[in-house]
């Protein structure tokens, strides 16, 4: 083995050593036909044209032409790993979900960490929320807890999601990231203040994936065996300790090792340093929800821990790297609507929107039978239903079982014990404007009570360092919002912007000219 190389760097060497006793496999086409020559195409004479009959070439080329699948529209860049969830505390009084059945119970899990806005080749060390999605393979089917590393989000109404993501991605003409788009949207939607403040704090750039917390973020509903329900939030706190990257280190790493997060996770697991997270819930009764000072289903708000303490449930442990990235990480599909009995959705509008959006995007990206892909398959449950056929149907298509319901032939029967919790709703049906549902109280508490003086200083510097590149009228809107949170918050950012704006040449076209370049003096003068 090469000296002092890490397991990720030595992956191929390790693969070879594992197979040392084996003879190399026979090279085949996709159909399994042995290949005699994989280095030369069939031609008429040494300089002649190709023959269509060269199926070794066409088989290879046609497959290569179709290798790429659409990247995820958000969370395109990610790392994955596998492990287990172990119950350490009894919460059966809240939930009948089999995953929580008894202390000591272990459930296999798959986890994917990701950034949000960047493409699949983008750097791991950018300032961006991180996805932290967990798939629990339970006996009652898969439970997908599609979380982030922040307990809140930028918006509370899902109709804004496409516009929000468009504002974070590339300008439709220039194809450049555009600070005007980013800050115009944020400044016009002050419900984003909470998440923006978290994002531009030290927590905005985690040191890899192992040193950050995870949150289900949404409010969910837990239902016990007696049909009694409570609202809940899920938290998973890193046992490795929170570590973040400085702006300088993050920038350096984005150049030197843009896959820093993937590498760090792979190497930790490969060397037996299995990362773990302690899993907690917060619980709110329906009565408490009625008197909660905010909408308890608002994704831009937190539930104060002082009022709704963290209740420990178990441990998430990651102890296996993917065997193949494409098969197990690129193709994994997390879907918040995958909830086994005992875990249900709350009226959280953003969660409700995701219940549709996630399986919809998977059907586009992976095909309508994406749940047949091994990593997505609920392999610890027996899938039996009336869904048939479709592209890439990979199992036995449920054989000769009836494909209609009801039927008289003993095909799968509904399970009354799996009925959803019933709840009474009444109210006006219309589009409710939530734009001004108290966008500042919790942000003020975060700024004043949670951050110390140094952290507040860095927060303002980080915001100003990004906001400076937006137009002045957008800067003013943003500063007005920060000032409403706290006068100091706005004034510190404004002071930094004033400094930047005084230094900034207006409408400059920045052109890099090599010293001693061959450009004529006249051309240089025109730059």
């Amino acid at each position: 083995m090469a000296d002092s190389r890490d397991p990720a760097s030595d992956q191929m060497q390790h693969w070879k050593e594992q197979r040392a006793a084996q003879k190399a496999d026979v090279l085949t086409t996709g159909a399994g036909n042995p290949v005699g020559d994989k280095l030369n195409v069939i031609t008429v004479g040494p300089r002649g044209p190709l023959l269509v009959q060269d199926v070794v070439f066409t088989d290879e080329m046609a497959h290569f032409d179709r290798e790429r699948i659409p990247e995820r529209v958000v969370h395109a860049k990610g790392a994955g790993a596998f492990g287990y969830f172990e119950v350490t505390h009894d919460i059966t009084k809240y939930s009948k979900a089999k995953v929580f059945e008894h202390i000591g119970k272990k459930t296999p899990i798959a986890v994917r960490f990701s950034t949000v806005a960047g493409e699949s080749g983008s750097a791991d060390t950018v300032r961006d929320p991180r996805g932290f999605a967990v798939k629990f393979y339970t006996e009652d089917g898969n439970w997908d807890l599609v979380g982030n590393n922040t307990p809140i989000f930028f918006i509370r109404d899902p109709i804004l999601f496409p516009s929000f993501i468009h504002s974070q991605k590339r300008n439709p003409q220039t194809h450049l990231k555009d600070p005007d788009m980013v800050w115009d949207f944020w400044s016009l939607r002050p419900e984003s203040l909470h998440q923006v403040s978290f994002l531009f704090s030290d927590r905005g750039i985690p040191d890899g994936h192992r040193h950050m917390n995870g949150y289900g973020s949404h409010t969910f509903k837990l239902v016990n065996a007696n049909g009694e329900a409570v609202y809940c939030k899920f938290h998973y706190k890193t046992d490795q300790g929170i570590k973040n990257l400085s702006v300088e280190d993050a920038a350096r790493l984005s150049q030197e090792d843009p896959d820093y997060g993937i590498r760090d996770l792979f190497n930790a697991i490969a060397t037996g340093k299995y990362p773990s997270w302690t899993f907690y819930i917060q619980v709110m009764t329906f009565n408490q929800a009625e008197t909660f000072p905010f909408n308890p289903f608002d994704l831009t708000k937190v539930w104060p821990h002082k009022d709704y303490p963290l209740i420990p449930v178990g441990k998430l442990v990651l102890n296996r790297n993917p065997v193949n990235y494409f098969a197990e990480v690129e193709q994994i599909a997390f879907d918040p609507s995958n909830m086994p009995p005992g875990i249900e959705a709350s009226p959280d509008k953003m969660l409700q929107g995701r219940l549709f959006a996630y399986p919809d995007t998977h059907r586009h990206r992976l095909g309508p039978n994406y749940l047949h892909i091994p990593v997505n398959c609920p392999y610890r449950a027996r899938v039996a239903n009336y869904q048939r056929d479709g592209p890439m149907c990979m199992q036995d298509n449920q054989g000769g079982a009836p494909n209609y319901y009801p039927n008289s032939f003993g095909a799968p029967e509904q399970q009354p014990s799996a009925l959803e919790h019933s709840i009474q709703y009444s109210g006006e049906v219309r589009r409710f404007n939530t734009a001004n549902d108290d966008n500042v109280t919790q942000v003020r508490a975060f700024y004043v009570n949670v951050l110390n003086e140094e952290q507040r200083k860095r927060l303002c510097e980080n915001i100003a360092g990004h906001l400076k590149d937006a137009q002045i009228f957008i800067q003013k809107k943003a500063v007005k919002n920060f000032t409403e949170v706290h006068p100091d918050y706005g004034s510190h950012i404004q002071a930094l912007l004033d400094k930047y704006n005084a230094e900034k040449p207006k409408n400059a076209i920045h052109t890099f000219v090599q010293s001693g370049s061959h450009l004529a003096a006249r051309e240089k003068a025109n730059l």
Partner: nanobody, 117 residues
Framework: QVQLVESGGGLVQAGGSLRLSCAAS????????MGWFRQAPGKEREFVAT????????YYADSVKGRFTISRDNAKNTMYLQMNSLKPEDTAVYYC??????????WGQGTQVTVSS
């Protein structure tokens, strides 16, 4: 910064009682979630109990349920852990914890509880 100061630990015989206290600043006490954890020699730190600001909601580890009682006095910015019917397996360093909605966790220096048989 958040400062937590535990007291009340000591040596006690099996079946005996102790009352631990955790003092914090008013800002900490009114901002953070509060709870008790413990760490026995050679073991991981484990949850003991947690309490809401109003005292309405309390949660306990199964191993201490019915024997330990968590409480708080918001006027004194102090949280307590009344430990009755102590057992040798309760021997550990007991830590006060404050945690925020944003993942911050703060710990006191710990107070040693030793239960002899």
């Amino acid at each position: 910064q958040v400062q937590l100061v535990e007291s009340g630990g000591g040596l006690v015989q099996a079946g005996g009682s102790l009352r631990l206290s955790c003092a914090a600043s008013e800002r900490t006490f009114n901002t953070y979630g509060m709870g008790w954890f413990r760490q026995a020699p050679g073991k991981e730190r484990e949850f003991v109990a947690t309490i809401s600001w109003s005292g309405d909601s309390t949660y306990y580890a199964d191993s201490v349920k019915g024997r330990f009682t968590i409480s708080r006095d918001n006027a004194k910015n102090t949280m307590y852990l009344q430990m009755n019917s102590l057992k040798p397996e309760d021997t550990a360093v007991y830590y006060c914890n404050a945690n925020s909605e944003y993942g911050d966790s703060y710990w006191g220096q710990g107070t040693q509880v030793t239960v002899s048989s």
